[in-house]
Interface confidence: low
């Protein structure tokens, strides 16, 4: 059902981890561009996109990779307690813009122990491929759009 | 700048109904171009989105306003539309309605209006 037809999916992860969200986008979709934005009282603010430049500046702590195959996956690094809030992965289809998946962040204390990642379940959706429903594993480095 | 403005809001009983309506108050603007969502911010909560409507006329609903509430576009008039039946008090809330472009990341909201649902 898209945004709205479930609950957000809701994660949690400590200030100083990492989060990784897939979200599914149709196979007809794969050259569209996509979006991760903040819903913000002042708007659903875009803060990554896949089709913004790459040499982006130096501190920037959201990568967006379009893994194709239908399969969109967003990495939150180093989080902040300010990082707190609802996002959504959105893409600009042939159907128009459609919001694939809502992700309800929170924010715990710091642990103590290394970094961690928080893996957020796939996002299924009135709009999801089944072709596009595999699973990959995590990306190597030089795969992700870093810059 | 495009601003948004809502209207239809009010007091009802439970049972009644209402219509929002969200309207730009810039000419030139088009909802046909735009992802149109309807949230809510119930008193003291985080706002939700209730209904969204994308430039192709697909709709989505919230699980807690499915077969209550209908979202529609009038591209004539230029207007969105909330139309709430069957309303129960933890439907009150202040209600706005959202316009998003993913081109360009251009996106507006309106002031948003009071629904109050008692008896």
């Known amino acids: 059902q898209g945004i709205v037809g479930s609950l957000p999916e809701v994660l949690q992860a400590p200030v100083g981890s990492s989060i990784l969200v897939q979200c599914h986008y149709r196979l007809q979709d794969v050259k569209a561009q996509k979006v991760w934005c903040r819903f913000l009282p002042e708007g659903c603010q875009p803060l990554v996109s896949s089709a913004v430049d790459r040499r982006a500046p130096a501190g920037r702590r959201t990568f967006l990779t379009d893994l194709g195959g239908g399969l969109l996956q967003v990495e939150m690094v180093t989080l902040q307690e300010e990082d707190a809030g609802e996002y959504g992965c959105m893409v600009d289809g042939a159907r128009g813009p459609q919001i694939l998946h809502r992700v309800s962040l929170n924010i715990l204390p710091p642990e103590e122990e290394e970094e961690t990642h928080k893996i957020g379940s796939l996002a299924e959706n009135a709009f999801s491929d089944p072709a596009g429903s595999a699973n990959p594993l995590e990306p190597s480095q030089d795969e992700k759009s870093i810059p | 700048q495009v601003q948004l403005v809502e209207s239809g809001g009010g007091l009802v009983q439970p049972g009644g109904s209402l219509r929002l309506s969200c309207a730009a108050s810039t000419s030139g603007f088009s909802f046909s171009d735009y992802y149109v969502n309807w949230f809510r911010q119930p008193p003291g909560k985080q706002h939700e989105v209730v209904a969204s409507?994308?430039?192709?006329?697909?709709?989505n609903y919230a699980d807690s306003v499915k077969g209550r509430f209908t979202i529609s576009r009038d591209n004539v008039k230029n207007a969105v539309y909330l139309q709430m039946n069957s309303l129960k008090p933890e439907d009150t809330a202040l209600y706005y309605c959202?316009?998003?472009?993913?081109?360009?990341?251009?996106?507006?909201w309106g002031p948003g209006t009071q629904v109050t649902v008692s008896s």
């Open positions: 409507i994308n430039p192709n006329g697909f709709t």
């Open positions: 959202h316009a998003v472009r993913i081109s360009g990341g251009a996106n507006y």
